[in-house]
């Protein structure tokens, strides 16, 4: 008996052959002998199957002694043997219907478990093998589980289903909802602009939900809400922001943040939570600021910075075209008499600048320039 | 959106080897019978070659044993395999999906023109 | 195989009048014929499938009769986007054939 395996909603054709090559009478009946379909001279007929609407042949084939079952639209229930009568013959055919569904949305929030459930006829003993789209192999039976979905797992999950020695094929295309970024940091002197940018790492046609950042900076004790909003069909509208600082909000995706000036007292690390509409859980995204201020108080030249700085950054002050006079694994620096010229306040990270603010020191009989 | 797109065409000698592609999106190609459909300058349209849903291969006496017709599920891609061209197989070449119950064409794609010259 | 002949070759005609193709098989095949619609540098167009069924989309003045060996194409009230060539094909039987085509002009 030959088998053929099926798609749940796909089409299949089953295959019937006459020794001639002419039209002749066939009927497919299945395994309880209802008739499914034949032909009267060049007219298909159809039988009180259940798959009536479902079911046809192909006119086209049948003078080359081609009668072929084809059931469209296939469901688990489908799964039977099919027996085609021609020419004093019966063809048989066990056809095997096999469904591969996520367990929920296939739109999944990262850090979340993905599970997909294979759909299977009885008696039917089949194994499934899913590849991701970063490459990873999953073994399983009726239910494989893959936890802590990670953005690299967005994409086509290809599955293959195994019975009898035949095997069937499943796309199923995933997307883990997160952002570009798990972490960033920006780096501003005192008194610039600071531009936070959170871009999604996936799109969708509509877009709906709330988020909020709330920011620790590092001079409180405690992290308040900066900035709330609302996200309908892509389109941002401010809810609630603080009088200080008072941050301004793109009303277009990516969420853009723009905070009018970088202090001491806004230093620190933020987390921007968003949780979208039907979904269980929030997206999150952290982000840090440092801040640098260079100052000269009589003879003392001072640079600092203010913010999450990792313990191997290097803060130096040097004057222009020279060597470092002071460079400290340190939050702080400063050269006492410092002599004229312009110095530089430099942040760096393995010789990559990542910070840089001048200061312009004048003659001792005047006030220091800040460029 | 339903769409069918043929690449492959071109220039190519008598005895000479050519491969068609025919890409689709918007439905899922093994669901379908699919064929190759021709038409030559100036010249009606001609029946080339089909796969059907099974994947059971039928060709037009024209082309039988040059031809070879093929399909990839997983990339949703028909192809047309034309071996010993003759200047007769030049034409322009359109994939179209057959209906789900008749051997009529219901989506055609733009067409790749194959032209066989010395 | 199943010879199809369509007539006539082409014909000239204004916008509004009523336009009739013929294609006659050679060979009884039943109501299994379809209609196709071309225009320069395109694909064809599906018009009309087992002799009378219109395609979704098709306009209403597009009608198709006829079985067994003779079928009919009619356009009751040609419109401009109607100039075009016009091929029958049977469905019938494998090797598929299709008429060599009407082409519409401009009176």
């Known amino acids: 008996k030959k088998v053929v395996l099926g798609k749940k909603g796909d089409t299949v054709e089953l295959t019937c052959t006459a020794s001639q090559k002419k039209s002749i009478q066939f009927h497919w009946k299945n395994s309880n002998q209802i008739k499914i379909l034949g032909n009267q001279g060049s007219f298909l007929t159809k039988g009180p199957s259940k798959l009536n609407d479902r079911a046809d042949s192909r006119r086209s084939l049948w003078d080359q002694g081609n009668f072929p079952l084809i059931i469209k639209n296939l469901k688990i229930e489908d799964s039977d043997t099919y027996i085609c009568e021609v020419e004093d013959q019966k063809e048989e055919v066990q056809l095997l219907v096999f469904g591969l569904t996520a367990n929920s949305d296939t739109h999944l929030l990262q850090g979340q478990s993905l599970t997909l459930t294979l759909e299977s006829p009885p008696g039917s003993s089949p194994s499934v093998q899913c590849r991701s789209p970063r490459g990873k192999n999953i073994q399983g039976g009726k239910t494989l589980s893959v936890s802590q979905l990670e953005l690299q797992d967005s994409g086509t999950w290809t599955c293959t289903v195994l019975q009898n020695q035949k095997k069937v094929e499943f796309k199923i295309d995933i997307v883990v909802l997160a952002f570009q970024k798990a972490s960033s940091i920006v780096y501003k002197k005192e008194g610039e602009q600071v531009e936070f940018s959170f871009p999604l790492a996936f799109t969708v046609e509509k877009l709906t939900g709330s988020g909020e950042l709330w920011w620790q900076a590092e001079r409180a004790s405690s992290s308040k809400s900066w900035i709330t909003f609302d996200l309908k069909n892509k389109e941002v509208s401010v809810k609630r922001v603080t009088q200080d600082p008072k941050l301004q909000m793109g009303k277009k995706l990516p969420l853009h943040l723009t905070l009018p000036q970088a202090l001491p007292q806004y230093a620190g690390s933020g987390n921007l939570t968003l949780a979208l509409e039907a979904k269980t859980g929030k997206l999150h995204q952290e982000v840090n600021l440092v801040v640098m201020r260079a100052t000269q108080l009589q003879k003392n030249l001072t640079c600092e910075v203010w913010g999450p700085t990792s313990p191997k950054l290097m803060l130096s002050l040097k004057l222009e075209n020279k060597e470092a006079k002071v460079s400290k694994r340190e939050k702080a620096v400063w050269v006492l008499n410092p002599e004229a010229g312009m110095w530089q306040c430099l942040l760096s990270d393995s010789g990559q600048v990542l910070l840089e603010s001048n200061i312009k020191v004048l003659p001792t009989w005047s006030t220091p320039v800040q460029p | 959106e339903v769409q069918l797109v043929e690449s492959g065409g071109g220039l190519v000698k008598p005895g000479g080897s050519l491969r068609l592609s025919c890409a689709a999106s918007g439905f899922t190609f093994s669901n379908h019978y699919t064929s190759w459909v021709r038409q030559a300058p100036g010249k009606g349209l001609e029946w080339v070659s089909a796969i059907g849903a099974g994947g059971g291969t039928y060709y037009a006496d024209s082309v039988k044993g040059r031809f070879t017709i093929s399909r990839d599920d997983s990339k949703n891609t028909l192809y047309l395999q034309m071996n010993s061209l003759k200047t007769e197989d030049t034409a322009v070449y359109y994939c179209?999906?057959?209906?789900?119950?008749?051997?009529?064409?219901?989506?055609w794609g733009q067409g790749t023109m194959v032209t066989v010259s010395s | 195989d199943i010879q199809m002949t369509q007539s006539p070759s082409s014909l000239s005609a204004s916008v509004g009048d009523r336009v009739t193709i013929t294609c006659q098989a050679s060979?009884?095949?039943?109501?299994?014929l379809a209609w196709y619609q071309q225009k320069p540098g395109k694909a064809p167009k599906l018009l009309i499938y087992?002799?009378?069924t219109l395609e979704s989309g098709v306009p209403s003045r597009f009608s198709g009769s006829g079985s067994g060996t003779d079928f009919t194409l009619t356009i009751s009230s040609l419109q401009p986007e109607d100039f075009a060539t016009y091929y029958c094909?049977?469905?019938?039987?494998?090797?598929?054939?299709f008429g060599g085509g009407t082409k519409v002009e401009i009176k």
């Open positions: 179209a999906r057959e209906g789900w119950n008749d051997d009529v064409f219901d989506i």
């Open positions: 087992r002799a009378s």
């Open positions: 094909q049977q469905s019938y039987s494998i090797p598929l054939t």
């Open positions: 060979q009884d095949i039943s109501t299994w």
